[in-house]
């Protein structure tokens, strides 16, 4: 038998993507981060 | 709210065409996701699933019946539409269209709204 | 197709008994996807059929925790832990898994 359509069965979850800039001194500039679901990624 | 509401000429002689209509409201089937089908039951007897049809125009029959069966939409008019070509005496029956839905928005896939059916019978 | 059987038919309970209803298919309805689309329906005499349970054993919303499912691959069981009054009808088993879509034959809930 063929198979009725359904979704593709994985969960979806929702993470909040929080851009951030970070001063770390005068004289050493910014570092500028993105995080996704609790971890720096860039 | 969701409901759903069938309607259909009650009465039809053997050979002749069934034209079904499910009229809803509180969804549209232009929604990604959204879905509607139709299923019968004989008087007294169980139920049967015949035709679906999603948002996207895509359509699932009952092979056994499939050569006798058109589903089409009104997205516009949310209304859904059945046809079954050269009836007989078994198709004499309360025929119910009822909401399916597998979109991630509204994750609802089961028939948990059905309309309160449309009753026909088939005799010469 | 994939044939839904139902026992019993008939079951007769009195209020406040526990009743069991089986569902077994004849091949798995096990979707491709990883989900068991096995649902149960509750008609009551002259009304459309009411959602109880899908995929298997989730609980529809307003469905009164009495009742539960459970099963896996091809063999499936509705409890009801103490029946009411309003709990009288005809249930069926269906499966959403497979074209075509089909439903048991149905179990008549009465009283004795």
């Known amino acids: 038998d063929a198979e009725f359509r359904h979704d593709s069965g994985y969960e979806v979850h929702h993470q909040k993507l929080v851009f951030f800039a970070e001063d770390v001194g005068s004289n050493k500039g910014a570092i500028i981060g993105l995080m996704v679901g609790g971890v720096v990624i860039a | 709210q969701v409901t759903l509401k069938e309607s259909g000429p009650g009465i039809l002689k053997p050979s002749q065409t069934l034209s079904l209509t499910c009229s809803f409201s509180?969804?549209?089937?232009?929604?990604?996701?959204?879905?509607v089908g139709w299923i019968r039951q004989p008087s007294g007897k169980g139920l049967e699933w015949l035709a679906h049809i999603w948002w996207d125009d895509d359509k699932y029959y009952n092979p056994s019946l499939k050569s006798q069966l058109t589903i089409s939409k009104d997205t516009s008019r949310n209304q859904v539409f059945l046809k079954i070509t050269s009836v007989d005496t078994a198709d004499t029956a309360t025929y119910y269209c009822a909401r399916r839905s597998i979109t991630t928005v509204v994750p609802e896939d089961y028939f948990a709204y059905w309309g309160q059916g449309t009753t026909l019978t088939v005799s010469s | 197709d994939v044939l839904m059987t139902q026992s019993p038919l008939s079951l007769p309970v009195s209020l406040g008994d526990q009743a069991s209803i089986s569902c077994r298919s004849s091949q798995s309805i096990v979707h491709s996807n990883g989900n068991t689309y096995l649902e149960w329906y509750l008609q009551k005499p002259g009304q459309s059929p009411k959602l109880l349970i899908y995929k298997v054993s989730n609980r529809f919303s307003g469905v009164p925790d009495r009742f539960s499912g459970s099963g896996s691959g091809t063999d499936f069981t509705l409890k009801i832990s103490r029946v009411e009054a309003e709990d009288l009808g005809v249930y069926y088993c269906?499966?959403?898994?497979?074209?075509?879509?089909?439903f048991g034959a149905g179990t008549k809930l009465e009283l004795k």
């Open positions: 509180g969804f549209s089937l232009s929604t990604s996701g959204m879905g």
């Open positions: 269906f499966q959403g898994s497979h074209v075509p879509l089909t």
